[in-house]
């Protein structure tokens, strides 16, 4: 007769026997019998299985292809896959990080709101009034306009989102 309930956690039912699943890092060689427990074997080099399982083949570790801008962030074990990330200056194109693209630069008139990481691109924001950015950069924030008054100077040319103000000496001839 079948067991009154399903087999326990970490077990599977086959041929009226509750067999133990193979533990993470091991693959199934043969199902259990009444007299022998499930036969399991450790995954080979560069292979893994990350759950209790009845898989007959282990999965290959992910390859971090340097030609796609990838490098190893965390080496895989028999129980975990390799985690890839991107080379400096690049970020993943997807959550799975299968390829990389160059970090976006923020154009003049825009500053960096959030610097890119290995998994996210640069976030740019327009420079608000009183701030400017005159370079294309993946790191530079918007800079505040120079305060001419604190230097005892006057504004000779107004600033824009791309240019700083130009300060000059006060006109001494004015009464």
């Amino acid at each position: 007769p079948e067991p009154p309930t399903a087999c326990r956690e970490k077990q599977y039912l086959i041929n009226s026997q509750c067999c133990s699943l193979c533990q993470p890092g091991q693959k199934l060689v043969s199902d259990c019998t009444e007299f022998t427990e499930t036969e399991c074997l450790p995954c080979g080099e560069s292979e893994f299985l990350d759950t209790w399982n009845r898989e007959t083949h282990c999965h290959q570790h992910k390859y971090c292809d340097p030609n796609l801008g990838l490098r190893v962030q965390q080496k895989g074990t028999s129980e975990t896959d390799t985690i890839c990330t991107c080379e400096e200056g690049w970020h993943c194109t997807s959550e799975a990080c299968e390829s990389c693209v160059l970090h976006r630069s923020c154009s003049p008139g825009f500053g960096v709101k959030q610097i890119a990481t290995g998994v996210s691109d640069t976030i740019c924001e327009p420079c608000p009034v009183g701030f400017f950015s005159n370079v294309s950069s993946a790191f530079e924030k918007c800079h505040p306009w120079t305060s001419c008054e604190t230097k005892d100077l006057v504004v000779q040319q107004a600033g824009t989102n791309k240019t700083d103000v130009v300060c000059g000496p006060q006109d001494r001839l004015r009464a």
Partner: antibody, heavy 123, light 107 residues
């Protein structure tokens, strides 16, 4: 409370019989295989017998085969060990033990044990 | 039957010590090995199953490792309540068999 309580042990003469009982509570008794494990005074542990949830898989250690009989009554949440033709070498504390699986009495490990009952075989 | 050989048979240690007990199977048993703790006059208590998985409620200072024929139980920092006898047991094939035990004593 999840527990196993053995009873029925005592002093018995060689060649005589004894019946051990194990009362289970706090878990669904008929979901699990059950076993008897013994321990001679000052010695290690020895598996004696096991029975599947449905009593269709019953197995014994060679040392007790033909003399001991394991059985269970799921309606009473009870496990039994009938011991006949007892010998001095059967002297031990007998533990009732629960198996985390259900389907075989031939192998397993033991995630819950009773406190044991002492069987002394001596003339 | 599969023979289980434990070593050492006894070990003297102090509170805070790291203690390692080994168990060797006479045949390959995959990872089907359990470890038990037994205190005098008490029933054995399951510590570890499938060679390395901690039973619910067991302190994390206990750990198990190994696969195939060679297995280890480690107590990372011995506590006063850990002085006891430890047994390994294979459940790979019929009949289940135990190691001879390792007594952990106070130095």
């Amino acid at each position: 409370e999840v527990q196993l309580v053995e009873s029925g042990g005592g002093l018995v003469q060689p060649g005589r019989s004894l019946r051990l009982s194990c009362a289970a509570s706090g878990f669904t008794f008929d979901d699990y295989a059950m076993h008897w494990v013994r321990q001679a005074p000052g010695k290690g542990l020895e598996w004696v017998s096991g029975i599947s949830w449905s009593s269709d898989s019953i197995h014994y250690a060679d040392s007790v085969k033909g003399r001991f009989t394991i059985s269970r009554d799921n309606a009473k949440n009870s496990l039994y060990l009938q011991m006949n033709s007892l010998r001095a070498e059967d002297t031990a504390v007998y533990y009732c033990a629960k198996d985390p699986t259900a389907t075989t009495g031939a192998r397993g490990y033991f995630d819950l044990w009773g406190r044991g009952t002492l069987v002394t075989v001596s003339s | 039957d599969i023979q289980m050989t434990q070593s050492p048979s006894s070990v003297s240690a102090s509170v805070g010590d790291r203690v390692t007990i080994t168990c060797r199977a006479s045949k390959v048993i995959s990872s089907w090995l359990a470890w038990y703790q037994q205190k005098p006059g008490k029933a054995p208590k399951l510590l570890i199953y499938a060679a390395s998985y901690l039973e619910s409620g067991v302190p994390s200072r206990f750990s198990g490792s190994g696969s195939g024929t060679d297995f280890t139980l480690t107590i990372s920092s011995l506590q006063p309540e850990d002085f006891a006898t430890y047994y390994c047991q294979q459940h790979s094939s019929f009949p289940p068999t135990f190691g001879g035990g390792t007594k952990v004593e106070i130095k």
